[in-house]
Every structure is written in structure tokens, then in C-alpha cells.
């Protein structure tokens, strides 16, 4: 159904192979990515309220697909931004909660409950919103828009408690 407005291969924005996305735009895509659909010649990425397409063989397309497959994008993305300089300290453990998020929309009540449920968090840049955690289990939240099924992904149901800490020799490096 390539070309169908309501089908999974409708493109809101097509990115040419000649001009791949900037680092900043890729970070935005990583954060808001909800799903992808393999079409005949291109891949369509569904974000929260819009879509973008790129050629199947474009490196950035394969990178984003891989990122979502490994649950390193979208619901789970920690939101590192380029040129970050300041890092928040990890918060003290309080209780146990699930990792993952079902939406980019966080109400104040959700944010408060998130804070109360948090155990130690990964270190995040100031001003960034971690979408590592939400209130739903996997497959509970499914939003249908224009014929597309957007559900909480694998990361949304991470039963494992929150990250203990950042680890590794390069764990506190700044920009990607």
C-alpha cells in the first residue's frame, strides 16, 4: 500500500538519500520513534504524531531500525542531547519500578508517581526527560492513529528495576 494515505507506508516527510538527517534530527528521531514499517523501496518511521521515510539502504535508516529493534530508541531513549555539559546526580533508591514508557506525554501526576517510584536512575543531562519508565505493562497501551498501531514496546515493560548506576570507563562522557 505504498502511496496509500491511510496505509502503513504513507510518508509525511521523505528524506533524500543525498541529504541524510543531521545529528540533532537523528537524536529527535531516536527519542520520538514509535514504530517502523518496511515498504517496498523505503522504510517509514512512525513518530508520536508524524512520520518520516528514508530509502531502505540508507545507513541512517538501518541505524534507526536497529536502534528500535534493540529497544535503544523510542520509549526507552534516555534523551541525551548533543553538547550536554551538566549531569544530574543519581537519586537515592526509594522503591522498585519498571523501566519503559508508553508515551512521550507525561502528565504531572504521572511524573510525580514516576518520581515516587524511582530507584536509582541513570545519570541524565540537565533539562532532558528520561522516558525510561512509565506506568503501563507491555501490550497494554495501544493507540490507533490513521490505521497505525502504536503500542508500548518491549522496553515499556522492563520488569527489571531501575538502573543501578552508570557504568563503564566512558559512561559519563558528554555528547554523542
Amino acid at each position: 500500500n505504498e502511496g496509500s494515505v491511510t496505509g502503513s507506508c504513507y510518508c509525511g516527510k521523505r528524506i533524500s538519500s543525498d541529504s541524510p538527517p543531521s545529528v540533532q534530527f537523528m537524536n529527535r528521531l531516536r527519542k520520538h520513534l514509535r514504530a517502523y514499517h518496511r515498504c517496498l523501496y523505503y522504510t517509514r518511521f512512525q513518530l508520536l504524531s508524524w512520520s518520516v521515510c528514508g530509502g531502505n539502504k540508507d545507513p541512517w535508516v538501518q541505524e534507526l531500525m536497529s536502534c528500535l529493534d534493540l529497544k535503544e530508541c523510542g520509549h526507552a531513549y534516555s534523551g541525551i542531547v548533543a553538547h550536554q555539559k551538566h549531569l544530574l546526580p543519581t537519586s537515592p533508591p526509594i522503591s522498585q519500578a519498571s523501566e519503559g514508557a508508553s508515551s512521550d506525554i507525561h502528565t504531572p501526576a504521572q511524573m510525580l508517581l514516576s518520581t515516587l517510584q524511582s530507584t536509582q536512575r541513570p545519570t541524565l543531562p540537565v533539562g532532558s526527560l528520561s522516558s525510561d519508565k512509565e506506568l503501563t505493562r507491555p501490550n497494554e497501551t495501544t493507540i490507533h492513529t490513521a490505521g497505525h498501531s502504536l503500542a508500548a514496546g518491549p522496553e515499556a515493560g522492563e520488569n527489571q528495576k531501575q538502573p543501578e548506576k552508570n557504568a563503564g570507563p566512558t559512561a559519563r562522557t558528554s555528547a554523542t
Epitope: 534493540l70 529497544k71 535503544e72 534516555s78 541513570p122 507491555p138 518491549p154
Partner: antibody
């Protein structure tokens, strides 16, 4: 060819420490989600720990049985993952496998044996 | 945690027969973001590390004989070994990687009569 080579296992007394290493090659290490899985002799497989990629702050996750005692880290510049194991218990005795989760599959090393005994 | 229930625990078949191993998860492993099932199958022979046979529930790992196939979606999955050979004697495990912690089935021991 993808390779994961674990090292650092050995015999240690209860309460002691060991640091396991996992040297990777044959794939883009920085894009892989790394995990440790262990297997006691004659038993099934048990997930131990996970570390995410740089864009996600190298966030780490641990099985309840090792939380607070084990620390997972990675050095993307050296294509190596590490598992620091402190306050070891006899029940930590197992073969420890390093795994790399990529879109092309989940790769496993040959394992390194950790024996905790007095 | 997602519970993986594997059956049978063990089975003995004659060479050339077809083996079917079942794996059931306590919740769906199908991710709507990519329509993939986060399930893998492994073969483990004595003294060896687990060998990946199948990932994404049905994708055969490179180098794995085509007599091994995976099927299923959601919560019910099957590993089929058609025309079992002597070298297939091993323990087979299913594993979900949809969620942390990764969890494994209890294993199915396959023997040749």
C-alpha cells in the same frame, strides 16, 4: 567472524572478588546491548546483568540475586565489557557467559568458570 | 518477570523423525513497533556454550541447518527439527528478550533412540 572471549574466572573464597572481562570482535560493539548470563553445573540459564549503549547513558540492570554486589561496565574504545563481582557467595558458582545482542542475533562467548568455595 | 514454559522436558526419537518443542510465554513477545517476536532458540551440547539457532522467533541464524525452524507469535512458539540426526542430541532452550530480565525456558533434552 563474531567472537566474544571471556576471561577472569577462577577459584575464590566466599566474600571475595573477581573481575570478568569480555573481549569482542567481528561486530560493531558500541551498538550492541551487552549481557551476562550464567549457568550453574547441570542447571538452566540465568540472566545476570545488562548494559545499554552510549546514547542511553550506559544504563545497567541486574538480577535481584546479584544487585548491589556486581557491577557491569563497558569500554567501547576497547570493545570490552567487564563484570566486577564483589561479596561473592557459593551460589554464584557457575559458568559465566558474555552475550552481545545485535539485530543479527544474540552472540555468546565460550564462558569463564567462576568457583566460589572455601 | 516473563515466565517461559517449555515442553516437553525430554524426548527420545529415532533418527529421521521430526521433533517439536513448544515454548509458551506468560505475556506476548510481539512488539508492535516492528512486528517482531522477541524470542530465541538455543542448542546446548555438553560442555559447550549455548548456540543460537533461531532469533526473532523464526529467523534462522547463519550457518544453522535448514532442518531447524522456528514458528509462532505472541505467546506460543515452536522449534521444529525435521529429520533429526545424531548430532542434534542436546538440550534446547527458548529465551525471551522482550523484557529485562531475560528469561529462559527450563530446557528440553533431545535424545536419539
Amino acid at each position: 567472524e563474531v567472537q566474544l572471549v571471556e576471561s577472569g574466572g577462577g577459584l575464590v573464597q566466599p566474600g571475595g572478588s573477581l573481575k570478568l572481562s569480555c573481549a569482542a570482535s567481528g561486530f560493531t560493539f558500541s551498538n550492541a546491548v551487552m549481557n551476562w548470563v550464567r549457568q550453574a553445573s547441570g542447571k538452566g540459564l540465568e540472566w545476570v546483568a545488562r548494559i545499554r549503549t552510549k546514547p542511553n547513558n550506559y544504563a545497567t540492570f541486574y538480577a535481584d540475586s546479584v544487585k548491589g554486589r556486581f557491577t557491569f561496565s563497558r569500554d567501547d574504545s576497547k570493545n570490552t565489557a567487564y563484570l566486577q563481582m564483589n561479596s561473592l557467595k557459593t551460589e554464584d558458582t557457575a559458568m559465566y557467559y558474555c552475550t552481545a545482542w545485535t539485530t543479527e542475533g544474540i552472540y555468546w562467548g565460550q564462558g569463564t568458570l567462576v568457583t566460589v568455595s572455601s | 518477570d516473563i515466565v517461559m514454559t517449555q515442553s516437553p522436558d525430554s524426548l527420545a526419537v529415532s533418527a529421521g523423525e521430526t521433533v517439536t518443542i513448544n515454548c509458551k510465554s506468560s505475556q506476548s513477545l510481539l512488539y508492535s513497533g516492528n512486528q517482531k517476536n522477541y524470542l530465541a532458540w538455543y542448542q546446548q551440547k555438553p560442555g559447550q556454550s549455548p548456540k543460537l539457532l533461531i532469533y526473532w522467533a523464526s529467523t534462522r541464524q547463519s550457518g544453522v541447518p535448514d532442518r531447524f525452524s522456528g514458528s509462532g507469535s505472541g505467546t506460543d512458539f515452536t522449534l521444529t527439527i525435521s529429520s533429526v540426526q545424531a548430532e542434534d542430541v542436546a538440550v534446547y532452550y527458548c529465551q525471551q528478550y522482550y523484557d529485562t530480565p531475560w528469561t529462559f525456558g527450563g530446557g528440553t533434552k533431545v535424545e536419539i533412540k
